[in-house]
């Protein structure tokens, strides 16, 4: 089905539920820009490379971001 699109944001819905970090391939924080007027947090899952959109305002998502960044800082030399 061809489609018409207006703005180039990725997320159709956003979830307040954090994803399991073990299932995570990568986590992107995309700042607002001229293409998309809002911050988007996109979790790419290992299974099928599925992208999941997370609510930047959710407390649980903020905690997930902290946990992931803590994990990354442990790994970096």
């Amino acid at each position: 089905v061809p489609l018409s699109r207006t703005v180039r944001c990725t997320c159709i819905s956003i979830s307040n539920q954090p994803v399991n970090p073990r299932s995570l391939e990568k986590l992107e924080i995309i700042p607002a820009s001229q293409f998309c007027p809002r911050v988007e947090i996109i979790a790419t899952m290992k299974k099928k490379g599925e992208k999941r959109c997370l609510n930047p305002e959710s407390k649980a998502i903020k905690n997930l971001l902290k946990a992931v960044s803590k994990e990354r800082s442990k790994r970096s030399p």
């Epitope: 089905v1 997320c11 159709i12 307040n16 099928k48 992208k51 999941r52 959109c53």
Partner: antibody
Framework: QVQLVESGGGVVQPGRSLRLSCAAS????????IHWVRQAPGKGLEWVAV????????YYADSVKGRFTISRDNSKNTLYLQMNSLRAEDTAVYYC????????????WGQGTLVTVSS | NFMLTQPHSVSESPGKTVTISCTGS????????VQWYQQRPGSSPTTVIY?????PSGVPDRFSGSIDSSSNSASLTISGLKTEDEADYYC??????????FGGGTKLTVL
């Protein structure tokens, strides 16, 4: 519990306009992309349009592009479908649906509202 | 464009097993999740399978879903058929997300 209730269907002449509404309750409407899906009498399901949770993204099937406009009012938990230049082939039951996507994993459907385009 | 093709109708006797196929064209069916909906006459669709092979709570384990990459198809299998399973069944995937694509639907008759 989750409810999606469509209204605004009816009989309309070809070339005229109609606006459908869908009142949502029982879930976080403002986090959810919502769709319109239609089903012509005796036919299968056809995806029509989707609007993102904040209204900034709208996607349409080619069959309705340029004629239909999807919109939402998050303060009223309501979704709309403005249908212009209606054709006989737009005759269908129109369902408002919260379908599985990249944030939500549960599907909810309204009961549908019938639009008949006939002279 | 990605399309999903289903048989128009299938029929089987109560207690037997039936499989409804959904064949993708114009893309790989395995690259996006497939959902299956059941629609009884006069009712809205309800999900019987999501994410290829997951069952929502309340759907009996007689319903199962699978993907076969080699034939680029998805299948819905219903075992121990009951008369209440008589309905239309639709597969659904993406072209890609956020464009939803439905198969044409299969009418299941339980003889």
């Amino acid at each position: 519990q989750v409810q999606l209730v469509e209204s605004g269907g009816g009989v309309v002449q070809p070339g005229r306009s109609l606006r459908l509404s869908c009142a949502a309750s029982g879930f976080t409407f403002s986090n959810s992309g919502i769709h319109w899906v239609r089903q012509a009498p005796g036919k299968g399901l056809e995806w029509v349009a989707v609007i993102s949770y904040d209204g900034s993204n709208k996607y349409y099937a080619d069959s309705v592009k340029g004629r239909f406009t999807i919109s939402r009012d998050n303060s009223k938990n309501t979704l709309y479908l403005q249908m212009n230049s209606l054709r006989a082939e737009d005759t269908a039951v129109y369902y408002c649906a919260r379908l599985r996507d990249n944030a939500e994993y549960t599907d909810y459907w309204g009961q549908g509202t019938l639009v008949t385009v006939s002279s | 464009n990605f399309m999903l093709t289903q048989p128009h109708s299938v029929s089987e006797s109560p207690g037997k097993t039936v499989t409804i196929s959904c064949t993708g064209s114009g893309g790989s069916i395995a690259s996006n999740y497939v959902q299956w909906y059941q629609q009884r006459p006069g009712s809205s669709p309800t999900t019987v399978i999501y994410e290829d092979n997951q069952r929502p709570s309340g759907v009996p384990d007689r319903f199962s879903g699978s993907i076969d990459s080699s034939s680029n198809s998805a299948s819905l299998t219903i075992s121990g058929l009951k008369t209440e399973d008589e309905a239309d069944y639709y597969c659904q995937s993406y072209d890609p997300l956020p464009v939803w694509v439905f198969g044409g639907g299969t009418k299941l008759t339980v003889l």
